[in-house]
Interface confidence: medium
C-alpha cells in the first residue's frame, strides 16, 4: 500500500469510529502498525481468498478488487456499510445480514491496524483472474463473543487511564502525535518570515484500527457480488464481488481523515480457517445458481454467469467474525442459533482445508444498481450439520445509476443474535475528496 492508502485506511477507520451512533464512551483512537502490515502483506502474497489460519490473535479483514488496483475507500465502504444492519443495544444483526466487518471497524478496544496488498494473477478460491488482494490485520482482537463493540455514552467519558480525548476518540497520552509540538505553518515571502501556531489539532503518523481474532472464531462462508449493471451473478460461496465504480482512486483520495466517506457496498465474510466446521476449500466452490430467487428492483435484469457478467472492475471483501472470549478460546462452545439465524458452530482449530462442511442450497436474492435503498429482504442458505452459509443482497443506499448493484454475503455467528438495523450515521455515497 502507498503511504496515502495506509493513512486513508487508518483515518477512515478513525472517522467511522468517531462517528458511531449511538456515540461511544470508550472508543480508542487507532494507529498504524507496521508489524501487522508486514504480516498482512506476507499473507496477501499467498493469494488465497480465505483467512490466514496462522494469524493467531489477530483480526483479519479481506478485500479484493480486479484490474484497476486497490481502492481503499471501497474496501472500507464494504466493510462498514453493515452498520445499517447492526443494533448496538441489542447486539444483534438483521437476519441474513452481515455485521462482523462493521463491528470490527468500531470495536472500541482495538488500537492497531496493519494492511498489505498484493496483485494476484490467480486468487485461490475465486474464478476471476488478476485480482488485487488486500489483507488487514488488527490488534487487539475485536468481535469477542458476547461483547458489544463499544460502550454507548458520552464520547471519551470512559477513556482508559493514560488516555485523553481527541476528536471523540481516546488517544494515548504521550503518543507520537502528542510528543510533537503544536503544528506550525510558517509562510515566507522574500522579505517576510513569521511563525504562528495553527489550530491545536495535532497531526502525525497514521493512527489505526485493529480488530483481532483469536484462534477460535465463529465465521461464515458467504458470498457477495456486485456488478455495475448486472444484478444477478454466479459466484462461489466464499467470494464477494462488487464492481468498483470509479476507477481505483485510493491514491487520489485524501491521505487522512477522509470525510468523503465511501458509499455503501456489499461486504462479505470469509470462513475461518481456524475452525473445523467452516474450512475454506482449496478448490471446492459453491456456486450461486444462475437464477437468483429475488430481484429487488422492479426492473428485472437477467442473471449472468461470471464469464459475461462481471464488470472489469470488481471487488471482494471478507472478514473474520465473532470471537469467543479470550479466556474461552480453548473451550469455545457451539451455540445453536435462533431459527432466524444462520451461523457456524465453533470448534477447536483443526484445519481441514479440503473440506467445505457447509453446503449452500439456497441463494440470496439480487439487486439491481438502480435501487435507492437497502432492501430489507434477504435469503439465507440452509446448511448441513449445524454449519451454514448464507447469501443475501444489499444495495448501496441512494447511490444513483452509476453505482454498482450488490449481492452481499452474510457474516454472523454465535455470541451475537444479529438483528435489526442500527441507527448509525448514514453516510452519503462516496465522492472521493479532492478528485481531479
Amino acid at each position: 500500500l502507498t503511504d496515502e492508502e495506509k493513512r486513508l485506511m487508518v483515518e477512515l477507520h478513525n472517522l467511522y469510529r468517531a462517528q458511531v451512533s449511538p456515540t461511544a464512551s470508550d472508543m480508542l483512537h487507532m494507529r498504524w502498525d507496521e508489524e501487522l502490515a508486514a504480516f498482512a502483506k506476507a499473507y496477501a502474497r499467498q493469494c488465497v481468498w480465505g483467512h490466514n489460519k496462522e494469524r493467531g490473535r489477530r483480526g483479519e479483514n479481506l478485500f479484493a478488487i480486479t484490474d484497476e488496483g486497490m481502492d481503499v475507500p471501497l474496501a472500507m465502504e464494504e466493510w462498514h456499510h453493515e452498520r445499517e444492519h447492526y443494533n448496538l443495544s441489542a447486539a444483534t444483526c438483521s437476519p441474513g445480514q452481515m455485521c462482523g466487518h462493521y463491528t470490527q471497524v468500531v470495536w472500541a478496544k482495538t488500537e492497531r491496524i496493519g494492511c498489505g496488498s498484493h496483485f494476484c494473477e490467480k486468487l485461490q478460491g475465486v474464478e476471476e483472474t488478476n485480482i488485487e488482494l488486500l489483507v488487514c490485520n488488527y490488534e487487539p482482537p475485536g468481535n469477542v463473543k458476547g461483547k458489544r463493540p463499544y460502550q454507548e455514552g458520552t464520547p471519551c467519558s470512559q477513556c482508559p487511564s493514560g488516555y485523553h480525548c481527541k476528536n471523540s476518540l481516546c488517544e494515548p497520552i504521550g503518543s507520537p502525535e502528542d510528543a510533537q509540538d503544536l503544528p506550525y505553518l510558517v509562510t515566507e515571502a522574500p522579505s517576510f518570515r513569521a511563525t504562528e501556531a495553527s489550530d491545536s489539532r495535532k497531526m502525525g503518523t497514521p493512527s489505526s484500527l485493529a480488530t483481532g481474532i483469536p484462534a477460535f472464531l465463529v465465521t461464515e462462508v458467504s458470498g457477495s457480488l456486485a456488478t455495475k449493471a448486472l444484478p444477478a451473478v454466479e459466484t462461489q460461496a466464499p467470494t464477494s464481488l462488487a464492481t468498483k465504480d470509479p476507477p481505483s482512486m485510493a491514491t487520489e483520495a485524501p491521505p487522512c481523515v477522509t470525510t468523503e466517506v465511501p458509499s455503501i457496498l456489499a461486504a462479505h465474510s470469509l470462513p475461518s480457517l481456524d475452525e473445523e466446521p467452516v474450512t475454506f476449500p482449496k478448490s471446492t466452490h459453491v456456486p450461486i445458481p444462475k437464477s437468483a430467487d429475488k430481484v429487488t428492483d422492479k426492473t428485472k435484469v437477467p442473471s449472468r454467469s461470471p464469464e459475461n457478467s462481471l464488470d472489469p472492475k470488481m471487488s471482494l471483501t471478507g472478514a473474520r467474525e465473532l470471537l469467543p472470549h479470550a479466556q474461552e478460546e480453548a473451550e469455545a462452545e457451539a451455540e445453536l442459533p435462533p431459527s432466524s439465524e444462520v451461523l457456524a458452530s465453533v470448534f477447536p482449530a483443526q484445519d481441514k482445508p479440503g473440506e467445505l462442511q457447509a453446503t449452500l442450497d439456497h441463494t440470496g436474492h439480487t439487486s439491481s444498481k438502480s435501487l435507492p435503498n437497502f432492501p430489507n429482504t434477504s435469503a439465507t442458505a440452509n446448511a448441513t450439520g449445524g454449519r451454514a452459509l448464507a447469501l443475501q443482497s444489499s444495495l448501496p443506499g441512494a447511490e444513483g445509476p452509476d453505482k454498482p448493484s450488490v449481492v452481499s454475503g452474510l457474516n454472523s455467528g454465535p455470541g451475537h443474535v444479529w438483528g435489526p438495523l442500527l441507527g448509525l450515521l448514514l453516510l452519503p455515497p462516496l465522492v472521493l475528496a479532492g478528485i481531479f
Epitope: 502507498t2 503511504d3 496515502e4 493513512r7 483515518e11 472517522l15 462517528q19 502525535e177 510533537q180 509540538d181 503544536l182 503544528p183 506550525y184 505553518l185 501556531a197 495553527s198 489550530d199 489539532r201 495535532k202 497531526m203 502525525g204 503518523t205 497514521p206 491514491t251 487520489e252 485524501p254 491521505p255 487522512c256 481523515v257 477522509t258 470525510t259 468523503e260 466517506v261 453516510l427 452519503p428 455515497p429 462516496l430 465522492v431 475528496a433 479532492g434 478528485i435 481531479f436
Partner: antibody
C-alpha cells in the same frame, strides 16, 4: 511583512511546517481577498505518487507549487502576477478534504 | 457555488444562533472553519458534524445534500468571528462567502 510586486512580476512564497509529520500531508495554498473571499489556489500531494499537483483554473500556467520534505517546506512560485492576485496567502495542510491547519499568512500586493 | 446566510449575524450572549450554507450541487459533507480578525482560519467542524479539537461543545453542525448549518447553542463573546463553510466533494475546494457573527 508582505510583498509588493508589479503586474507581470514574480514572487516565491515559502511555508515551513513543524509539529507534524510533514511528508504525510497534502500541502495547499489558499488566498483570501475582499473581492474573492477564500480561494483555494494549489495543492501538492505526496512523494509516494511523485508529488502530483493541482491548481485552480485562475492560476494554472502561472503558479507552481512544490515541496521539500527534507525541509518541511512548501513553496509557491508565482509568475506573471496580476492585480487580482493580491491578497493574503495561506499555506494549509490537509489530511482529508478539509484543511487541518493554516499558516499565519503573508500578504501579496500586485500593483504598479 | 456555496452561499452562506446571513452575511452578518448579530446576537446577544446566551442566544442560540444558526447559520446556513447552501451548495449549488449536492455535496457529501460540509466543513466549517472559523476566522477571527487578523488571524488565519481554523478548522472548526469537519464532516458536517464533527467538532475539531478544542472546539466547544456548544457548537454543532448538521445538514445533508445541498443544505448545511452550523449552530451555537449559547453564544459567547469569544465566538465572535467569521465562519466559512467549505467543501471538496467536487473539484475544486470551494468556500462559502462567510457569515460574520457579531456579539452585541
Amino acid at each position: 511583512g508582505g510583498g509588493l510586486v508589479q503586474p507581470g512580476g514574480s514572487m516565491k512564497l515559502s511555508c515551513v511546517a513543524s509539529g507534524f509529520t510533514f511528508s504525510y500531508y497534502w500541502m495547499n495554498w489558499v488566498r483570501q481577498s475582499p473581492e474573492q473571499g477564500l480561494e483555494w489556489i494549489a495543492e501538492i500531494r505526496l512523494q509516494s505518487n511523485d508529488y502530483p499537483t493541482h491548481y485552480a483554473e485562475s492560476v494554472k500556467g502561472r503558479f507552481t507549487i512544490s515541496r521539500d520534505d527534507s525541509k518541511n517546506s512548501v513553496y509557491l512560485q508565482m509568475n506573471n502576477l496580476r492585480p487580482e492576485d493580491t491578497g493574503i496567502y495561506y499555506c494549509a495542510c490537509r489530511y482529508a478534504d478539509y484543511f487541518d491547519h493554516w499558516g499565519q499568512g503573508t500578504t501579496l500586493t500586485v500593483s504598479s | 457555488v456555496m452561499t452562506q446566510s446571513p452575511a452578518i449575524l448579530s446576537v446577544y450572549p446566551g442566544e442560540k444562533v444558526t447559520m446556513t450554507c447552501r451548495a449549488s450541487l449536492s455535496v457529501s459533507y460540509m466543513h466549517w472553519c472559523q476566522q477571527k480578525p487578523g488571524s488565519s482560519p481554523k478548522s472548526w467542524i469537519y464532516a458536517t458534524s464533527n467538532l475539531a479539537s478544542g472546539v466547544p461543545a456548544r457548537f454543532s453542525g448538521s445538514g445533508s445534500g445541498t443544505s448545511y448549518s452550523l449552530t451555537i447553542s449559547r453564544v459567547e463573546a469569544e465566538d465572535a468571528a467569521t465562519y466559512y463553510c467549505q467543501q471538496w466533494s467536487s473539484n475544486p475546494f470551494t468556500f462559502g462567502s462567510g457569515t460574520k457573527l457579531e456579539i452585541k
